[in-house]
C-alpha cells in the first residue's frame, strides 16, 4: 500500500504531550461479583445524559438505573465488564466521558493478597446435622471462564459447608494438581476455599476443578482459565468515528476521532489535497496536508472543526493517530452542498483510502 | 513465534556507511514500528528512530537526523538502519525492536576504525 | 526532549532483598514509562510498561509505580538471577529517551 507526499514541512512530533486525552487512559471502576456499583458522569451542564456500554446504547432494566447523571449497577456480575461511555447533550455541543468497569473477583497485580474476604464462607455447622457438601455462595462461582493477562494473580473460589467440614482439592485438567505442576507453586487457603496462582503464564491455561467432599458426599466447580499474553498495543479509534458529515456553503462541521491508547497518542487531522492542479506528486503518491495535530498549541485535537466552508473544503479528512508502538487511520468524507439544500448526516458511506486500514 | 534477526557484525573505516538489516517473523510486519536503538561500549541506550512500515512513516531522533535512515521492506518484512558519515563514536551495537519494545533482535556490532 | 534521570547509578544487594530503583522525567510524561532489563552481551528485556504493568512472564516480584516525572522500579525479594542492568524508558514522545541505568550486584 502507498505512502503519501506532504504538501508543506510540518513538524509532526509535539514539543510536550498533549493535555486531554480522557479516553487513553479511562478511569477503572471495580466491584465484586455480586455487589452494586454507582458511577456518576463527570460532565457538566448536561442537558441529556445518554449512555452506552461497548458502544452499544443502555437503557434502564431490572438491574441498571439511570438517574440524572448516575448510573447504578445492581447485583455486578462480570458480564457487566466493559467500556462504559456517558454523552451528555447541550444546545452546542456534546461531550463524552468513558470509564471501565471490570467485575472479577480474579486478584489483579499489585493487589493486595491477603484475601480478608471470604472469611464467611466458612460455616460452621451444628454437629448432630450431618450434611453432605452445598455450595454456600454460588455468586462467587459464576464466572466460569476466566481471562486474565499474563503475570497477574489469579484466584478460583469455591465456598462450601457441610456436616463434617469438608475438604477441598484441585484437579488441573482433570488430574490431581501438584505445586510440581507450575514454577512456584500455588496456595489453597482452605478456610477461604480458595486456589491462588501467582503471575500466571500462558502454560496455566486450562480447566481446574475444586472437589470438595466429605463421607456424605462430593461436590465439584470447574473453571476454565485463559491466560491473555498481556501486551500494549497501538491506538484504537471508536468505529464510526469520524463520521460522514454534509452541510451547505458558508456552514461549519465538526469531525470526531476517539481513540483508545495505552500510551499517550498523537492525533493528525491529514486531507487530500492537490499541488498545481494535481491530487499525485512525481512519485505517485498522493498529496496530504496536515491540518491539526495534537501538541502544546493544539486543543481538544480528537475534534476538527471546519467554519464557513467552501465547495473546496470537501473531500476525505483522516484521522491518524500514532503512539511508540503503531498506527491507527480512520476517515469520513465531506459533502459540501449549495446553499439551497439542506444538510444532513451521511452514516451509509464508508470510505478509507487504499494505503489506510 | 516472534523474532527479530539482525545481519552480522560489520568493520567500517571513518565516513563511510553502514546499513543494517532486521527481519521479522512471527506476527504483522506492517501493524507495529520497527525501532533502531543502539549502546556503545559500556554505555546506556540511545534511541536512533522508528518506522512504521504499513506506510514508510519514519521518525528520528534529532542527533541522528540526516545521517541515519530508515526504511522497510513490506515484502520481505525487513527494516533498515543505515548510518552515514561514520565516525568512531558511533562502533557500537545496534538493536533493532517492534513497536511495543517486547522483541529485540540479537543486535549487530558496527565497529568503525581506520 | 525529555531528560531522564535514574538513579541510583549502581546497588549491591543481598538475595531476598527489597530493591528499589527511582527514574525522573524532565517533562511530565504521564504514565508512559518502561523498565528494562539486560544483562551482559543480551537484548534488554521488556519488564514493565506504561508505569504499572507487568509484561507477559515476567515475575511478580518486579513491579513499577508512579505517574507524571516521578516513577519506581522495585524487587520485592531480589533473587541471584536478577543480576543485571535495569534502564527506565519514556515513550511519551519521541526521541524516546532512556535512562543511564542501574547496575545491579549481589553482596
Known amino acids: 500500500r502507498p505512502s503519501f507526499s506532504l504538501v508543506e514541512d510540518t513538524t509532526l512530533e509535539p514539543e510536550e504531550p498533549p493535555t486531554k486525552y480522557q479516553i487513553s487512559q479511562p478511569e477503572v471502576y471495580v466491584a465484586a461479583p455480586g455487589e452494586s456499583l454507582e458511577v456518576r458522569c463527570l460532565l457538566k451542564d448536561a442537558a441529556v445524559i445518554s449512555w452506552t456500554k461497548d458502544g452499544v446504547h443502555l437503557g434502564p432494566n431490572n438491574r441498571t438505573v439511570l438517574i440524572g447523571e448516575y448510573l447504578q449497577i445492581k447485583g455486578a456480575t462480570p458480564r457487566d465488564s466493559g467500556l462504559y461511555a456517558c454523552t451528555a447533550s447541550r444546545t452546542v455541543d456534546s461531550e463524552t466521558w468513558y470509564f471501565m468497569v471490570n467485575v472479577t473477583d480474579a486478584i489483579s497485580s499489585g493487589d493486595d493478597e491477603d484475601d480478608t474476604d471470604g472469611a464467611e464462607d466458612f460455616v460452621s455447622e451444628n454437629s448432630n446435622n450431618k450434611r453432605a457438601p452445598y455450595w454456600t455462595n454460588t455468586e462467587k462461582m459464576e464466572k466460569r471462564l476466566h481471562a486474565v493477562p499474563a503475570a497477574n494473580t489469579v484466584k478460583f473460589r469455591c465456598p462450601a459447608g457441610g456436616n463434617p467440614m469438608p475438604t477441598m482439592r484441585w484437579l488441573k485438567n482433570g488430574k490431581e494438581f501438584k505445586q510440581e505442576h507450575r514454577i512456584g507453586g500455588y496456595k489453597v487457603r482452605n478456610q477461604h476455599w480458595s486456589l491462588i496462582m501467582e503471575s500466571v503464564v500462558p502454560s496455566d491455561k486450562g480447566n481446574y476443578t475444586c472437589v470438595v467432599e466429605n463421607e456424605y458426599g462430593s461436590i465439584n466447580h470447574t473453571y476454565h482459565l485463559d491466560v491473555v499474553e498481556r501486551s500494549p498495543h497501538r491506538p484504537i479509534l471508536q468505529a464510526g468515528l469520524p463520521a460522514n458529515a454534509s452541510t451547505v456553503v458558508g456552514g461549519d462541521v465538526e469531525f470526531v476521532c476517539k481513540v483508545y491508547s495505552d500510551a499517550q497518542p498523537h492525533i493528525q487531522w491529514i486531507k487530500h489535497v492537490e499541488k498545481n492542479g494535481s491530487k499525485y506528486g512525481p512519485d505517485g503518491l498522493p498529496y496530504l496536508k496536515v491540518l491539526k495535530h495534537s501538541g502544546i498549541n493544539s486543543s481538544n485535537a480528537e475534534v476538527l472543526a471546519l467554519f464557513n466552508v467552501t465547495e473546496a473544503d470537501a473531500g476525505e479528512y483522516i484521522c491518524k493517530v500514532s503512539n511508540y508502538i503503531g498506527q491507527a487511520n480512520q476517515s469520513a468524507w465531506l459533502t459540501v452542498l449549495p446553499k439551497q439544500q439542506a444538510p444532513g448526516r451521511e452514516k451509509e458511506i464508508t470510505a478509507s483510502p487504499d494505503y489506510l486500514e | 513465534q516472534v523474532q527479530l534477526v539482525q545481519s552480522g557484525a560489520e568493520v567500517k573505516k571513518p565516513g563511510s556507511s553502514v546499513k543494517v538489516s532486521c527481519k521479522a517473523s512471527g506476527y504483522i510486519f506492517t501493524s507495529y514500528n520497527v525501532h533502531w536503538v543502539r549502546q556503545a561500549p559500556g554505555q546506556g541506550l540511545e534511541w536512533i528512530g522508528s518506522i512504521y512500515p504499513d506506510n514508510g512513516d519514519s521518525s528520528y531522533n534529532q542527533n541522528y537526523k540526516g545521517r541515519a535512515t530508515i526504511t522497510a521492506d513490506k515484502s520481505t518484512s525487513t527494516a533498515y538502519m543505515e548510518l552515514s558519515s561514520l565516525r568512531s563514536e558511533d562502533t557500537a551495537v545496534y538493536y533493532c525492536?517492534?513497536?511495543?519494545?517486547?522483541?529485540w533482535g540479537q543486535g549487530t556490532l558496527v565497529t568503525v576504525s581506520s | 526532549d525529555i531528560q531522564m534521570t535514574q538513579s541510583p547509578s549502581s546497588l549491591s544487594a543481598s538475595v531476598g532483598d527489597r530493591v528499589t530503583i527511582t527514574c525522573k522525567a524532565s517533562?511530565?510524561?504521564?504514565?508512559?514509562i518502561a523498565w528494562y532489563q539486560q544483562k551482559p552481551g543480551k537484548a534488554p528485556k521488556l519488564l514493565i510498561y506504561s508505569a504499572s504493568y507487568r509484561y507477559s512472564g515476567v515475575p511478580s516480584r518486579f513491579s513499577g509505580s508512579g505517574s507524571g516525572t516521578d516513577f519506581t522500579f522495585t524487587i520485592s525479594s531480589l533473587q541471584p538471577e536478577d543480576i543485571a542492568t535495569y534502564y527506565c524508558?519514556?515513550?511519551?514522545?519521541?526521541?524516546?529517551?532512556f535512562g543511564q541505568g542501574t547496575k545491579l550486584e549481589i553482596k
Open positions: 524508558q519514556q515513550h511519551s514522545t519521541t526521541p524516546y529517551s
Open positions: 525492536a517492534r513497536g511495543d519494545f517486547a522483541y
Open positions: 517533562n511530565g510524561v504521564s504514565n508512559d
